[in-house]
Amino acid sequence: CKAMHVAQPAVVLASSRGIASFVCEYASPGKATEVRVTVLRQADSQVTEVCAATYMMGNELTFLDDSICTGTSSGNQVNLTIQGLRAMDTGLYICKVELMYPPPYYLGIGNGTQIYVIDPEPCPDSDF
């Protein structure tokens, strides 16, 4: 296992619709053809996996159908979008990148992106 540098923004504010996008960029030491990207959430010292996708270079990222993540790739950059976020989902979202094939295997973990989420103000009741 060899180390690899991964960069991501330090802090992002999600939209009022609970959507946060950020770029995860990795310094690929070689010509990887198969890459795995995992988003981890760290909150109160606990780390949980949010979503993961494996993709072939030049192809789209494919997350599971029920995943809250979507993404696109371009060269050594992965543009990740996490949706359905609520205030309670505020936390540090860490990008983990693995170069799966061809060998050697490389692993890189970013410092994380602190995502802040605000629950939208409830709409005032309207009389009809």
Epitope: P9, A10, V11, V12, L13, A14, S15, S16, S21, F22, A43, D44, A87, T90, L92, N111, G112, T113, Q114, Y116, I118
Partner: antibody
Framework: QVQLVQSGAEVKKPGASVKVSCKAS????????ISWVRQAPGQGLEWMGW????????NYAQKLQGRVTMTTDTSTSTAYMELRSLRSDDTAVYYC?????????????WGQGTMVTVSS | EIVMTQSPATLSLSPGERATLSCRAS???????LSWYQQKPGQAPRLLIY???TRATGIPARFSGSGSGTDFTLTISSLQPEDFAVYYC?????????FGPGTKVDIK
């Protein structure tokens, strides 16, 4: 070195608007947030809101909602805070501060402050 | 909104004495998101402690922070003349971010 440099002091009449700038240097501007904090004479620190320089999304303190607008110009690494319908109790020193987000979760770099005086 | 309270409002001590400042949050705050700032007259605040207990770059070892949950403490082990100032705690665990009202440390 990493620093935030703010625009100069302003004197405004009640009902007017003020726009304070905060120019960042020495770091990747879009990777961090910019918070605005004000301090009335002899008072404590009041958080006004913040902007995510990465995507331009904003969050404002409830008491200022509708009167304040925070923006960024990523081409010049500058953040702006505009406050409208000024009142005498808006007289304060206005600070911008960098929100780190990851390792320190704090306002690690502060501007020098901009004195805004509202007086008729 | 998380309300931060600080005590005492004023602390009158002599140089060389130990200062203990308290900060309480109205609801639990992850210690990673609790910071302390020092402010001297006519100056911008300066980050002292982040993550409840980690000293910021260039901050002397006489400053230390501790605590978790709702109760946090800033300790200055031996007050130096330049330490007489106002100290604020602040949380950025939840929006809106909030500051405590401050504790003024003045010379006895």
């Amino acid at each position: 070195q990493v620093q935030l440099v703010q625009s100069g002091a302003e004197v405004k009449k009640p009902g007017a608007s003020v726009k304070v700038s905060c120019k960042a240097s020495g770091y990747t501007f879009t990777s961090y947030g910019i918070s605005w904090v004000r301090q009335a004479p002899g008072q404590g620190l009041e958080w006004m809101g913040w902007i995510s320089a990465y995507n331009g999304n904003t969050n404002y303190a409830q008491k200022l909602q509708g009167r304040v607008t925070m923006t960024t110009d990523t081409s010049t690494s500058t953040a702006y805070m505009e406050l409208r319908s000024l009142r005498s109790d808006d007289t304060a020193v206005y600070y911008c501060a960098r929100l780190t987000g990851t390792t320190s979760h704090a306002f690690d770099i502060w501007g020098q402050g901009t004195m805004v005086t509202v007086s008729s | 909104e998380i309300v931060m309270t600080q005590s005492p409002a004023t602390l009158s001590l002599s140089p060389g004495e130990r200062a203990t400042l308290s900060c309480r949050a109205s609801q639990s705050v992850s210690s990673s998101y609790l910071s302390w700032y020092q402010q001297k007259p006519g100056q911008a605040p300066r980050l002292l402690i982040y993550g409840a207990s980690t000293r910021a770059t260039g901050i002397p070892a006489r400053f230390s922070g501790s605590g978790s949950g709702t109760d946090f403490t800033l300790t200055i082990s031996s007050l130096q003349p330049e330490d007489f100032a106002v100290y604020y705690c602040q949380q950025d665990y939840n929006l809106p971010f909030t500051f405590g009202p401050g504790t003024k440390v003045d010379i006895k």
